[in-house]
Amino acid sequence: LPKAPVITTPLETVDALVEEVATFMCAVESYPQPEISWTRNKILIKLFDTRYSIRENGQLLTILSVEDSDDGIYCCTANNGVGGAVESCGALQVKMKPKITRPPINVKIIEGLKAVLPCTTMGNPKPSVSWIKGDSPLRENSRTAVLESGSLRIHNVQKEDAGQYRCVAKNSLGTAYSKVVKLEVEVFARILRAPESHNVTFGSFVTLHCTATGIPVPTITWIENGNAVSSGSIQESVKDRVIDSRLQLFITKPGLYTCIATNKHGEKFSTAKAAATVSIAEWSKPQKDNKGYCAQYRGEVCNAVLAKDALVFLNTSYADPEEAQELLVHTAWNELKVVSPLCRPAAEALLCNHVFQECSPGVVPTPIPICREYCLAVKELFCAKEWLAMEEKTHRGLYRSEMHLLSVPECSKLPSMHWDPTACARLPHLDYNKENPKTFPPMTSSKPSVDIPNLPSSSSSSFSVSPTYSMT
């Protein structure tokens, strides 16, 4: 007798590993024999699709080599014309051992930046990703995190982050390891020990010492008055990523010596500079032999201090006067950060105008020396405490700064404004003006032994200072 189809073994969820065989069984009782069709995600599976095998009159569907894209809902439908068609459905869950699809790569990164080591994985169940640094599991901290994607992110990379890394992907079916990659942390060149300034007698030997570090280890070059050092011997040693360079000189003239530490990061270079002056005791060339030319100031350090319209004297004893004089100011300027708020603007004015002297507007370019009275105002009024401390250190041989050698004039050698008012430069903003108390706060100490002329004052800080000797 005819009998409508009945599915006696409903489809069940099938778990299958990638590249393995998966079979769905749809046992049907009916008469006459039914026609059985199969669908995946409601799309008919064609009988001639070679990825499938349909046997036992359609009751067995076999996926011959499971791919991860085969997961979905599979249904069998049986129909023999007697009664309605019947259907049963079951899921295929493709299980997959962990696989690393985007492994980490070697990374070179500059200290302080963010590093990301990729590790993208596949797998079912979804693998958990962890990282190994060296031989130990990597512990996450405030700077280190494993992202949802599996990638390792390190904020503000430090030297100690350098090393060998690998990622590990794990699920219930297995574990996958990436190849070992290297994180190299590069560090900008930095000077650990700057060369010290010296005041020596003519014909003596001086050794300038400069120590720098960085990754890769920097190279050190020495510059004399803007040119590569032409004489003197250089000795270098490298230990624990620190380079130590000693320049021995036979001194026959004053000079500005710059230690330049350079290292390479890809196509770019990082540079650190430190300068020291070597002056000769009793060295004082006459003013008429000042050698140089006049130009608008184009630097940065003294921008707010120098008069906008004046030309400054650039000393051609330096190969590149603008750079050499700017470096001299820059080196001394940093030391002014620790002085009192009363002293600092006055000292900055003295420094800038002493190194970048105002040009005489006459026929031949010459620097205008600062008037003695204004130099003494800085020394005995605004910076009395600091100046005293500096002189004490100088006498005891403890002073390491450039300032006492080239960046601070000897007030006693400067001309007085009472001799010829046009022959020296003034610092009008050093005058404390009762009508304009913004310039400097009133003094609480006793009146200094300085004759400070009563000149108009303003709240800006443009001063002009210059020495009476040159470095040629």
Epitope: K291, G292, Y293, C294, T316, P361, G362, V363, V364, P365
Partner: antibody
Framework: QVQVQESGPGLVKPSQTLSLTCTVS??????????WSWIRQPPGKGLEWMGV???????YYSPSLKSRTSISRDTSKNQFSLHLSSVTPDDTAVYYC?????????????WGQGTQVTVSS | SYELTQSPSVSVALRRTAKITCGGD??????TQWYQQKPGQAPVLVIY???RRPSGIPERFSGSNSGNTATLTISGAQAEDEADYYC??????????FGGGTHLTVL
């Protein structure tokens, strides 16, 4: 761009005074950091500096010509002038006026095209 | 007076280096200028303050100055560099001095 141009007689008799004027355009002769010189060049010979007038009117003269040379200026016309007294045929030359600039170490960075002066009776 | 000594003539092969010297007592302590003068033309400043080039002057012109000699160097001389060259200094009394001039021939 500053321009300088000499003018004056091309022929001067011996023992007379040679007077030349230099007219400056594109810049003031009273501008700080500039000076204004007279330079001459006898035929087939080298350059000889004669004297200079500074932005403030002060003057300096070549030691060898000091007794015969005078440089003056007329700021309203932006001109400066050379006066050379008691000329002789040895003063025959091309006379140039030129600007000196502190920006180029007092070098002469602008020259006139020169004016030929012949001393002859 | 201050005397500046130049040799009257210097020859150089095309594209080779020419050196013109200017001798003076302790000239190294003074700013030295160099001028180029072609026939019938006014001089042109080519070097100031020993070694600085005004804008528009080719890089082949360079200068140096130390001791008693200042030097003008023309690296890779061109035919158009054939001219008279004069050195110039100011002394401490605000007097300007010129050298006698050197004629450069480019062969």
């Amino acid at each position: 761009q500053v321009q300088v141009q000499e003018s004056g007689p091309g022929l001067v008799k011996p023992s007379q005074t040679l007077s030349l004027t230099c007219t400056v355009s594109g810049g003031s002769i009273t501008a700080r950091y500039y000076s204004w010189s007279w330079i001459r060049q006898p035929p087939g010979k080298g350059l000889e500096w004669m004297g200079v007038i500074a932005y403030d009117g002060s003057t300096y003269y070549s030691p060898s010509l000091k007794s015969r040379t005078s440089i003056s200026r007329d700021t309203s016309k932006n001109q400066f002038s050379l006066h050379l007294s008691s000329v002789t045929p040895d003063d025959t030359a091309v006379y140039y006026c030129a600007r000196g600039s502190s920006r180029v170490a007092a070098a002469f960075d602008s020259w006139g095209q020169g004016t030929q002066v012949t001393v002859s009776s | 007076s201050y005397e500046l000594t130049q040799s009257p003539s210097v020859s150089v092969a095309l594209r080779r280096t020419a050196k013109i010297t200017c001798g003076g007592d302790n000239i190294g302590s003074k700013n030295t200028q160099w001028y180029q003068q072609k026939p019938g033309q006014a001089p042109v400043l080519v070097i100031y303050a020993d070694s600085r080039r005004p804008s528009g002057i080719p890089e082949r012109f360079s200068g140096s100055n130390s001791g008693n000699t200042a030097t003008l160097t023309i690296s890779g001389a061109q035919a158009e560099d054939e001219a008279d060259y004069y050195c110039h200094v100011w002394d401490s009394s605000t007097n300007a001095w010129f050298g006698g001039g050197t004629h450069l021939t480019v062969l």
